[in-house]
């Protein structure tokens, strides 16, 4: 029962995590304009992995997609790649884990196969979570570097009199979503791996041994060998419970001129 609960919880946690990774990847608020100690502007800039947006005091928001591939920073491309790999691995992991769930019966699938599938999905979730955490962390590091660079020369003089205020960017909501989601996916993966241990039939094969005692001759022959996953060294004979067949671009989000009523 505990194994089923651990596996089910691992699946749910991973599902939430991957949904979060997808959400973070799609979000526009990876970096947001730093408002602290800055002149108050009537526009608010924020950027995502796929487009940058400007929200005006007027209520209009304008978003422009990054329509170039080669002109983008290598770091941004790397972050995109990490997030996409994380999503793909997570999605495959989810698909595999659905069939691995103990509460779902598919034909005459053996528990050993379910154990292997659980382990596979667990590893996929772990790698997926690590990809998301790495991607978000790389982007965060990029932001921190750029923040201090722009702080160092925040006011760039133009002909002495005129000044251009550089827009500084700080952590956006997507980073926190990404970190939490990556962590959840990682935890879910670990739970799946733990559940795998309990799923695997681990009956140890005892060779037939003859004990020659005075006046008696008793031979103990335990049951035949069953496949083991090799996790741990538990030599107890476990009863394998069968769960049974249960039925359980340049885009502008402008309203029309006056949004007439």
């Amino acid at each position: 029962m505990a194994v089923t609960a651990c596996q089910g919880l691992g699946f749910v946690v991973s599902l939430i995590g991957i949904a979060g990774i997808i959400a973070a990847t799609c979000m526009d608020q990876w970096s947001t304009q730093d408002l602290y100690n800055n002149p108050v502007t009537a526009v608010f800039n924020y950027q995502g992995l796929w487009r940058s947006c400007v929200r005006e005091s007027s209520g209009f928001t304008e978003c422009r997609g990054y329509f170039t591939l080669l002109g983008l920073p290598a770091m941004l491309q790397a972050v995109r790649a990490l997030m996409i790999v994380g999503i793909v691995l997570g999605a495959i992991g989810l698909l595999v884990s659905i069939f691995a769930l103990k509460c779902i019966r598919i034909g005459s699938m053996e528990d050993s196969a379910k154990a292997n599938m659980t382990l596979t999905s667990g590893i996929m979730f772990i790698v997926s979570g690590l990809c998301a955490i790495a991607g978000v962390s790389v982007f965060a590091n990029m932001l921190v570097t750029n923040f201090w660079m722009s702080t160092a020369n925040m006011y760039t003089g133009m002909g002495g009199m005129v000044q251009t205020v550089q827009t500084r960017y700080t952590f956006g909501a997507a980073l926190f979503v990404g970190w939490v989601a990556g962590g959840l996916t990682l935890i879910g993966g670990v739970m799946m791996c733990i559940a795998c241990r309990g799923l695997a039939p681990e009956e140890t094969n005892y060779k037939a041994v003859s004990y020659h005692a005075s006046g008696h001759s008793v031979a103990y022959k335990p049951g035949g060998f069953k496949a083991s996953t090799g996790f741990g060294s538990n030599t107890k004979n476990k009863k394998i419970y069968d769960g049974g067949a249960r039925t359980e671009d340049e885009v502008q989000s402008y309203p029309s001129k006056h949004d007439y009523v």
Epitope: A42, E56, S57, R64
Partner: antibody
């Protein structure tokens, strides 16, 4: 057609208070930022206050900060300007305006005269 | 605060001639996020509220005749009327729409010579 109709102007003594109202129609009021702008006789336009869209953000120039308060009632489609501690230099024609692309003001009221005099 | 300097204070131009009004900002009004200049131009006739001509420095508001042109970037902007008409007599204002407090230029009074 967008319409902005003001009320509440008049003559007030220095140190007194006045509340201007601006009733809006012809557009979805809650979706747009709104501003108050004034113009003293023979002078340039002077921005007085803005109520930003998408959050309760209000902005004022130093000349009126702490004395004037901009507010809005989306259910009544009305913008307000509460003016306290009025001074002679606050005498002007007050306009309410709807914000548009680029934070420009595309629709204006006809203007309301406010005179601060003893 | 951002200082907006408009020149000239007044301008007399013959009908059909070109009129040019300049506007200078003490800081750049270019937003790096969308590469747009947050400068607005208005026309005000006596006894009337201002009328929007251009936003984002050069985007003409609907209904504004195409003899009006807005140009410029960063700190220097220009409003040009290619062929002055009698109905163009008014005071023209430019406005910083990027930084709070929003500030207006002193206005340019355009008259017919």
């Amino acid at each position: 057609e967008v319409q902005l109709v003001e009320s509440g102007g008049g003559v007030v003594q220095p140190g007194g208070s006045l509340r201007l109202s601006c009733a809006a129609s012809g557009f979805t009021f809650s979706k747009f930022g709104m501003s108050w702008v004034r113009q003293a006789p023979g002078k340039r336009l002077e921005w007085v206050a803005t109520f930003s869209s998408g959050g309760d953000y209000t902005f004022y120039p130093d000349s009126v900060k702490g004395r004037f308060t901009i507010s809005r009632d989306n259910s009544k489609n009305t913008l307000y300007l509460q003016m306290n501690s009025l001074r002679a230099e606050d005498t002007a024609v007050y306009y309410c305006a709807k914000l548009y692309y680029g934070n420009s003001m595309d629709s204006w009221s006809q203007g309301l005269s406010v005179t601060v005099s003893s | 605060d951002i200082v907006i300097t408009q020149s000239p204070d007044s301008l007399a131009v013959s009908l059909g001639e070109r009129a040019t009004i300049n506007c200078k900002s003490s800081q750049s009004l270019l937003n790096s996020g969308n590469q747009r200049n947050y400068l607005t131009w208005y026309q005000q006739k006596p006894g009337q509220p201002p009328k929007l001509l251009f936003y984002w420095a050069s985007t003409r508001e609907s209904g504004v005749p195409d003899r009006f042109t807005g140009s410029g970037s960063g700190t220097d902007f220009t409003l040009t009327i290619s062929s002055l008409q009698a109905e163009d007599v008014a005071v023209y204002y430019c406005q910083n729409a990027y930084y709070y407090p929003f500030t207006f230029g002193g206005g340019t009074k355009l008259e017919i010579k």
